[in-house]
């Protein structure tokens, strides 16, 4: 019975998006009062996990020591203090790469591209897959932008951007998936460099804050037009 | 539900001035490019100015470069469009709309309009 | 500038008629062409952007394609609340330019 007790915080370091075979590290922070930490992970039994709190309680650590398909997926903890459980965490989306093969990111026309024009990335995989991603290296939401054809299985997917500005430009990878588990993406693909010179007119210095600014992904070229779960994933659907 | 109102039109002398607002709601403001397009009586639609969502790029289109100045406050959710030196040809209905990132704008407020004349 | 062309500025069809309106561009606008809608109470709202990706909560019925310089909107089963004007807009490149418009009207 979840009680009146504020949420905890639930975090993975590293981070939420996680190799094959590579360890995380899952923390779930309460209150100094939690007896018990307990993580649940969606459509399996509950609980997932059950752990007693670390010194000084207010926090408790669930370990992976090695990143597998069985791990991917949606989890959320609670505490349980003498007055009862607490209210459930925000969910944490644990992601994990590596299930597929690479994909292939391409820039159209050109990964040269002149502040305020237009640029493409394409995403294309050799098998046919139906969810395709889109990562910047270094930006404040390292996963920008998902995207599905609502089932229909594709080679490619095409990431407009416009009107592009110096904060777009940078490292971009993509990565492609199986509706059935946005969980488990393919090996990410090489990286692309996306370079932006000159200007059609003199901008403004650039802020530092990063392209994630979407999207759709919203966007801000990848700018989402959906909620931002609590693992930095940002979904877009289109 | 995403919302943009805009206010501050009206009647004004030629090379008089007029400061345009667009109150944003139901998205995260900071997060989007914003637009101003305007359409005069009859006519099509103009696109006016742009801003980047963190105010670090403006474009203008040249009808009112050097006469208009767009601007944002990220903190009251607010778009600006200072015009200066107006001339009997910016008479028209201005539009602020949200920047989608992909060359389109996604919402479009309902106009306020501005008429320029002696 | 990108100029945009729209050669009918009025067009008259039957409810239930399936209605292309078309764009031309003086260059290559790489697909980013979108279509707007303005009712004759002034509100605007995107239809497709992108060419062909349809806006959330637009109608199946409105539909894009094209490519290079040559676009078309389709309305395949023309409503009753579809009579209205329609711009294209090219996102390409800044400044950003519309259409001349065209005008839809019921028979």
């Known amino acids: 019975q979840a009680g009146p007790l504020p949420k905890p915080t639930l975090w993975a370091e590293p981070g939420s998006v996680i190799s094959w075979g590579n360890s995380v590290t899952i923390w779930c922070q309460g209150t100094l009062e939690a007896r018990e930490y307990r993580l649940d992970k969606e459509e399996s039994p509950a609980p997932w996990d059950r752990q007693n709190p670390l010194e000084p309680k207010n926090k408790a650590r669930f370990s992976i020591p090695s990143m597998t398909e069985d791990y991917a997926g949606r989890y959320r903890c609670y505490y349980r203090s003498p007055v009862g459980w607490s209210q459930p965490s925000d969910p944490l989306e644990l992601v994990m790469t590596g299930a597929y093969s690479k994909p292939t990111l391409s820039a159209l026309p050109s990964p040269l591209v002149t502040s305020g024009k237009s640029v493409t990335l394409l995403c294309q995989s050799r098998s046919p897959m139906d969810t395709f991603l889109l990562i910047k290296e270094r930006a404040a939401h390292p996963l920008l932008h998902l995207r599905s054809e609502h089932g229909a299985q594709q080679h490619q997917a095409e990431f407009p951007m416009s009107p592009v500005t110096s904060v777009h430009g940078g490292t971009y990878r993509c990565f492609s998936s199986h509706g059935f588990s946005h969980y488990l993406l393919s090996h990410p693909s090489d990286p692309l460099e996306l370079i932006v010179s000159g200007s059609l007119e003199d901008p403004r210095p650039s802020p530092t804050r990063s392209v994630s600014t979407a999207a759709g992904p919203e966007d801000q070229p990848l700018m989402p037009t959906g909620s931002v779960p609590h693992s930095g994933l940002r979904r877009h659907w289109e | 539900e995403v919302q943009l109102v805009e206010s501050g039109g009206g009647l004004v002398k030629p090379g008089g001035s007029l400061k345009l607002s667009c109150a944003a709601s139901g998205f995260t403001f900071s997060d989007y490019g914003m637009h101003w397009v305007r359409q005069a009586p009859e006519k099509g639609l103009e696109w006016v100015a742009y801003i980047f969502s963190g105010s670090s790029t403006i474009y203008y289109a040249d009808t009112v470069k050097g006469r208009f100045t767009i601007s944002r406050d990220n903190a009251k959710n607010t778009l600006f469009l200072q015009m200066t030196s107006l001339r009997s040809e910016d008479t028209a209905m201005y539009y602020c709309a949200r920047a989608d990132g992909r060359g389109a704008m996604d919402y479009w407020g309902q106009g306020t309009s501005v008429t320029v004349s002696s | 500038d990108v100029q945009m062309t729209q050669t009918t500025s009025s067009l008259s069809a039957s409810l239930g008629d399936r209605v292309t309106i078309s764009c031309r561009a003086s260059q290559d606008i790489s697909k980013f062409l979108n279509w707007y809608q303005q009712k004759p109470d002034g509100t605007v709202t995107l239809l497709i952007y992108y060419t062909s990706r349809l806006h959330s909560g637009v109608p199946s019925r409105f539909s894009g394609s094209g490519s290079g310089t040559d676009y078309s909107l389709t309305i395949s089963n023309l409503d009753q609340e579809d009579i209205a004007t329609y711009f294209c807009?090219?996102?390409?490149?800044?400044?950003?330019?519309f259409g001349g418009g065209t005008k839809l009207e019921i028979k």
């Open positions: 807009q090219q996102g390409n490149t800044l400044p950003w330019t």
